[in-house]
Amino acid sequence: ESLGWDIAELQLNHTGPQQDPRLYWQGGPALGRSFLRGPELDKGQLRIRRDGIYMVHIQVTLAICSSTSTSRHHHPTTLAVGICSPASRSISLLRLSFHQGCTIASQRLTPLARGDTLCTNLTGTLLPSRNTDETFFGVQWVRP
Amino acid sequence: ESLGWDIAELQLNHTGPQQDPRLYWQGGPALGRSFLRGPELDKGQLRIRRDGIYMVHIQVTLAICSSTSTSRHHHPTTLAVGICSPASRSISLLRLSFHQGCTIASQRLTPLARGDTLCTNLTGTLLPSRNTDETFFGVQWVRP
Amino acid sequence: ESLGWDIAELQLNHTGPQQDPRLYWQGGPALGRSFLRGPELDKGQLRIRRDGIYMVHIQVTLAICSSTSTSRHHHPTTLAVGICSPASRSISLLRLSFHQGCTIASQRLTPLARGDTLCTNLTGTLLPSRNTDETFFGVQWVRP
């Protein structure tokens, strides 16, 4: 572990209350194929415990969705991954809109510091799928 | 190699017969930029040879496709990556539908064990592109 | 550094002149969360300085885009990542079309050699977003 191979892969637990756009995550072998090895969860949000450059990746699929579903709703459905705390480091790292699709998936390299908490904000009014092969979020430490 | 840096990047060889939704892969420098360093191919399916957490990634593009192609077909075109053998470990790891798009691309971290064979099932009646820059599938061992 | 952990994450600087489909990138902490640790930029194009297998990833979002924007334009908007120099190694590594979406994102493993310059060609007449959470391009050395 001293090599700094911090890594986590999370599955969706639930969405937040109406005014809270954050997705709440869970992880652990008992839940399926999700795990936390280094990073930790704080009220469903992922907290980094080791400084470094991380590969952050995410896939979110909307529930009961067809190519026309997203066009039925007035507000665009957008997923943003960012550092939400500490407030001094708050920034959006990765952002995608669904448009006429039902799934977004992406990844990026970004420096993260111990104590950074990552939030995944799903704006719009569509419920994401909780299937573990359709919606997941993970980080992988890749170098100091 | 003892570090466990198992890695593979594959290109599409062919689709299966009509009732077989699996994509059949190939790899090796003679074929282009695909390679297998650790994992192996068993009848076009990728077999893992070392336990660990892997980053699995895939991109599949449909052949002769426009944004209307996928909507013309009644059956949704879906790509699922999963462990197909041994049967006791069979599970879907990653799933995406094309909807009104012609390409899906995603990645995830997942624990895999020696002997796990990964299958990539393309359901629907649309043919995937065999261009090596449009359709590819790979795994990378990232930690024990 | 001797471990060969070459890595870079870039943000969009600007597009090329009318007949030049290349995207021009920039990187460095002063610019935000982009960085170059090993690879270098040559006139906005990424040059590799160490042989090995790399994970290449990209996300490009079109500016002022809705699901109908891309369908309004006659020429399909396509993003291709490839080796553009040296000419002897010129090849397309990864290619995606936007179709009715506004964002493409993908990743792949590929062998790269010292001196390879990667180009990201955006064909079509739509302007990409320069927002750093919407458009980015990166490489990560993963093994010799």
Partner: antibody, heavy 120, light 111 residues
């Protein structure tokens, strides 16, 4: 406070059209979808159709040929029109707001309903 | 169309006891990690009122004595302890696919 109020004719002649207006307050039609449901002693509760926040509509296939739903966002009104009514269309007609989650399709607020009798 | 069959059609439960109402779907209404089944209460002369959504989520303002469970094709609404004001007809509704359909209703009487 969220409210929906239907206003309709009460009595409709057989083969004629039924028009109902649903006036809403406490929420915006640009954010929420509105469903139409009817209730009769013979058939219980029947979902008829929905108009989404964008104005796109979905209808129960059994009614698609004779049903249209439209709206005026600025007036906070949804309009329901069903053609060729017969006696078995006699029912209470409700408009109902879709739940906050657009793809959940539960109905969290309902109008009081308007009673429609089809008779000559 | 998905047919929802409720049972029993009516039941009488003593004050303070448990009322259990069943709803069976002709095919699974579970997908995407949720069960798209909802429960409503309707009193005479009033519109239906949403009690439970996604099989087990209590709608805001609904008393905690109401609970829902189930997945796939079999769902249950429980009321415990039953109170006088719970006398009503209860309906299940699915939203797995179009058209959305309702169960035939279960009339609850308090003894």
């Amino acid at each position: 406070e969220v409210q929906l109020q239907e206003s309709g004719p009460g009595l409709v002649q057989p083969s004629q059209s039924l028009s109902i207006t649903c006036t809403v307050s406490g929420f915006s039609l640009t954010t929420y979808a509105v469903h139409w449901v009817r209730q009769s002693p013979g058939k219980g509760l029947e979902w008829l159709g929905v108009i989404w926040s964008t104005g796109i509509t979905d209808y129960n296939a059994d009614f698609i040929s004779r049903l249209s739903i439209s709206k005026d966002n600025s007036k906070s009104q949804v309009f329901f029109k069903m053609d060729s009514l017969q006696s078995d269309d006699t029912a209470i007609y409700f408009c109902a707001r879709n739940h906050y989650y657009g793809n959940l399709n539960a109905m969290d607020y309902w109008g009081q309903g308007t009673s429609v009798t089809v008779s000559s | 169309d998905i047919v929802l069959t409720q049972s029993p059609a009516s039941l009488a439960v003593s004050l303070g006891q448990r009322a259990t109402i069943s709803c069976r779907a002709s095919k699974s209404v579970s997908t995407s990690g949720y069960s798209f089944m909802h429960w409503y209460q309707q009193k005479p002369g009033q519109p239906p009122k949403l009690l439970i959504y996604l099989a087990s989520n209590l709608e805001s303002g609904v008393p905690a004595r109401f609970s829902g469970s189930g997945s796939g094709t079999d769902f249950t609404l429980n009321i415990h302890p039953v109170e006088e004001e719970d006398a009503a007809t209860y309906y299940c509704q699915h939203s797995r696919e179009l058209p959305y359909t309702f169960g035939g209703g279960t009339k609850l009487e308090i003894k």
